[in-house]
Structure formats: C-alpha cells, structure tokens
C-alpha cells in the first residue's frame, strides 16, 4: 500500500512539476521592469526566453520574438537548453513512469521490470528538476549582475541637462514558477526512487535448511543472506514462510481494465 501510494504520489508531483517547467519555459515574464525607486513610466517592459514584451498603460501590448540565434547572449542560450533538456527528460520520465505504475498492469510485466522503470523515471525526474532549477538560477544570477551594473549608472547625464532613465530588470513570475516546478519534479523523482526500493525489497533466501525428524541432531546449513539491490536479474520475491497477513502490495493484482490518459 505504502509503495503504491509513494509511487503514485511521486508520479503526480512530478507531473505537476513538469507542467510547471513547461509553463515557466513558455512564460514571457522571466524578467520584469523594476518599478521600485523608478519614475512612474506609462510603459512596462518584461522579457522571456523567447520574446520581449512591452505593455503600455493604454492596455496595448506588443511582443517581439528573438529572431536570431547568434545574436543572443550565451547565457540565455544555456538557460533555454537547460529548460528544454529538463522538459524532454521529464516527458520521457512521465512516459516511463506511467508503465511503471503498480496500479497499472501491462501484460505479464514482472515487478523487477516495474522497479527498474520506476528507478529510471525517478532519476529522469531528478535530473529534469535539477536542469530547471539550474536554468532558472543561471537566469536569476544574470539578472542580479545586470541589475547592479545598471544601478551603478542608472542615470547617465548628457551635459548635466538631460537624463536618460536606464531600465532595470528584476525577477519575473516565471523564475518563481520554475524554481517551484523544478523542486516538485525533484521531489517527485526522489519519491519514485524510494518507491522503487519498495517494489523490489532486499531478498532474504533461506537455502538448504534440512530438518531431520529422527535423531537428535539437526543439520543447519546457512545459505547466507543474499543482499539484493532489487535491480538484479533475480529479484522475484521468494517467500518461504507467510505469517498470514498480506499487505496490499503483496497481493497479486490481476489484469483489469484501466483508463489512463
């Protein structure tokens, strides 16, 4: 029961996280015009990974895509790459984890295969989350650096008469969405890895135990405790004794109709 819950929750948390990473990547508000200590402008600037936008107080909004690859800062390209890698890994992880879910039966898939798939998806979610967090953090660092650089020369005087107001940018909503989403994907991945251990617990084999009815001597051959990681070829649960109480995870679930979208 606990394993199924952990796996299911891990999947849902990762799903929300990846949806958040996709949303953050598509959002235009990665950096927004800093309004603090600035003259009240009738124009509000904000920028995303793919385009920059200007919203006028009139309500008119205009967005322009970055129609160049070579002209863009390397850091921006790196952030784009990290977010895309995060999305791709997350999407593959989701696909793998759907088939790994204990509540879904596909043919005669063994628990060992499900355990492997759960671990694979978990690792993918962890890497996906880390990519998103790294991408957002790199962008945030870039913003902080630029913010203080522009603050240093915020007003550039022209002959002491005319002033040009430098537009400073601060953290946009997409950064917070990205951090939270990356964190959720990471947590979901960890949960999947934990669930994987439960799917294939450490194997305890009681080998070559012979009981002699006649006589007083009992021969006991310790076969050792074969420590299994659960990811080997022989990961089938070999239970010698059964106390009678079965957990939900131990009950064999038979193929049934499932609607999964």
């Amino acid at each position: 029961m606990a394993v199924t819950a952990c796996q299911g929750l891990g999947f849902v948390v990762s799903l929300i996280g990846i949806a958040g990473i996709i949303a953050a990547t598509c959002m235009d508000q990665w950096s927004t015009q800093d309004l603090y200590n600035n003259p009240v402008t009738a124009v509000f600037n904000y920028q995303g990974l793919w385009r920059s936008c200007v919203r006028e107080s009139s309500g008119f909004t205009e967005c322009r895509g970055y129609f160049t690859l070579l002209g863009l800062p390397a850091m921006l390209q790196a952030v784009r790459a990290l977010m895309i890698v995060g999305i791709v890994l997350g999407a593959i992880g989701l696909l793998v984890s759907i088939f790994a879910l204990k509540c879904i039966r596909i043919g005669s898939m063994e628990d060992s295969a499900k355990a492997n798939m759960t671990l694979t998806s978990g690792i993918m979610f962890i890497v996906s989350g880390l990519c998103a967090i790294a991408g957002v953090s790199v962008f945030a660092n870039m913003l902080v650096t630029n913010f203080w650089m522009s603050t240093a020369n915020m007003y550039t005087g022209m002959g002491g008469m005319v002033q040009t107001v430098q537009t400073r940018y601060t953290f946009g909503a997409a950064l917070f969405v990205g951090w939270v989403a990356g964190g959720l994907t990471l947590i979901g991945g960890v949960m999947m890895c934990i669930a994987c251990r439960g799917l294939a617990p450490e194997e305890t084999n009681y080998k070559a135990v012979s009981y002699h009815a006649s006589g007083h001597s009992v021969a006991y051959k310790p076969g050792g405790f074969k420590a299994s990681t659960g990811f080997g070829s022989n990961t089938k649960n070999k239970k010698i004794y059964d106390g009678g109480a079965r957990t939900e995870d131990e009950v064999q679930s038979y193929p049934s109709k499932h609607d999964y979208v």
Epitope: Q33, C53, V54, S57, G59, F60, E62, Q163
Partner: antibody, heavy 118, light 113 residues
C-alpha cells in the same frame, strides 16, 4: 464610430465640488485606458488624470492630486471625475479622451466647461 | 516632472512652404524594451478638441495626411509639414507619453503669412 460625450460641467464656488461624467461608445470601453485633459481659457493643454483598464490603476497631475478622483463604470461605459476643493485655477474645458497605441490620446470628446468663481 | 519645451511658440508661413516645429524633453522618451519613442503630436483648431497626428514619435495616425511627419529620438523631436495648406492653421502640441504625468508642450501657433 467612437464617441465620447462629457457632461456635468458648470459654475461652482471655490471650495465646492463637481462631478464630471463621460459616456463612451463605439469601442470596447472596458479594455481601454481613459483620461481627462483640461484646457484653461486661452491656455495650452494640461493632462489631469488617467485610469487604466483591468486593475484600474489611477494617475494624477500634481496640481489635482488629493482633490480629484477618477473612476470608471465598465458596465455603463462611463468615466467619471470627482472634483473636490475646487480652485479658480481649475477653471477650464475638461476633455474626456481615450488612450491608445503609444499611450497617445486618439479620441477626444467635445469637452465640458467648468468655471470656478465666487 | 518631464518638461516639454516647444519652439517656436508661433510662426507665420506661406502656403506651400515647409514647416518644422521642434520639441525637446527633459528626459529621454525612448523605451529600451521596444526601441520606440513615446512622444505624440496633436493639432488643435480654434473651437475644436485636439486631434492626434503622430504617436511613437513618427507613426502617423490613420486618416492624417502624409504631408505630416514626425521624427527624432531620445529627447529631440520634430514635426514637419512638407507643404503647408490653409487648413493646417492651428496650434500644435507635443506630449510626453512615457512618464506620468503625461506633460504637454506649451504649443506652437501656426498662422498663414
């Protein structure tokens, strides 16, 4: 056709109050920022106040801040300017305008005259 | 507040002549986000409300004759009437559309010689 029709002007004593109204038609009022601009007799144009669409941010000229209040009723397609503590220097023709691209005032009403005199 | 300085305050021009009106702002009206200058030009004829001619410093409003053109960037702007017509007699105003308060220039009165 875009139309802006002002009303509510008149003669008022210094310190008195007046409420100007502007009825808008021919465009999506709720999606537009609208402003009041005034013009004293024989003088130039002076921007008074703006109210944006959506969250309805309000902006005022320093000369009217704390005395005038701009508001809107999107259901009635109406813009209002509540003018309190009126002074002689508030005497002007008040125009209701729509803000559009570039924050420029692309449509203007015919104006309503406000005279503050004892 | 942004100060808009218009010059000349008045000018007398013969029909068919080229007219240039200057407008200077105390701060740059150029927005770095879209590289547009937030300055508008208006025409006001006697007894009428003002009419928008130019926005974004150089974009002509629909219905405005092409003899009217706007230019300039940052702090210095110009309204040009390539060939003055009798119906162009009016007062012309520039306006800062970038910073609140949205200040106007004092106006330039254009008369026929």
């Amino acid at each position: 056709e875009v139309q802006l029709v002002e009303s509510g002007g008149g003669l008022v004593k210094p310190g008195g109050s007046l409420r100007l109204s502007c009825a808008a038609s021919g465009f999506t009022f709720s999606n537009s920022a609208v402003s009041w601009v005034r013009q004293a007799p024989g003088k130039g144009l002076e921007w008074v106040s703006t109210i944006t669409s959506g969250v309805s941010y309000t902006y005022y000229a320093d000369s009217v801040k704390g005395r005038f209040t701009i508001s809107r009723d999107n259901a009635k397609n109406s813009l209002y300017l509540q003018m309190n503590s009126l002074r002689a220097e508030d005497t002007a023709v008040y125009y209701c305008t729509r803000q559009f691209k570039g924050n420029a005032l692309d449509y203007w009403g015919q104006g309503t005259s406000v005279t503050v005199s004892s | 507040d942004i100060v808009m300085t218009q010059s000349p305050s008045s000018l007398s021009v013969s029909p068919g002549e080229r007219v240039t009106i200057s407008c200077k702002s105390s701060q740059s009206l150029l927005n770095s986000g879209n590289q547009k200058n937030y300055l508008a030009w208006y025409q006001q004829k006697p007894g009428q409300p003002p009419k928008l001619l130019i926005y974004w410093a150089s974009t002509r409003e629909s219905g405005v004759p092409d003899r009217f053109s706007g230019s300039g960037s940052g702090t210095d702007f110009t309204l040009t009437i390539s060939s003055l017509q009798a119906e162009d007699v009016a007062v012309y105003y520039c306006q800062n559309d970038y910073f609140y308060p949205l200040t106007f220039g004092a106006g330039t009165k254009l008369e026929l010689k």
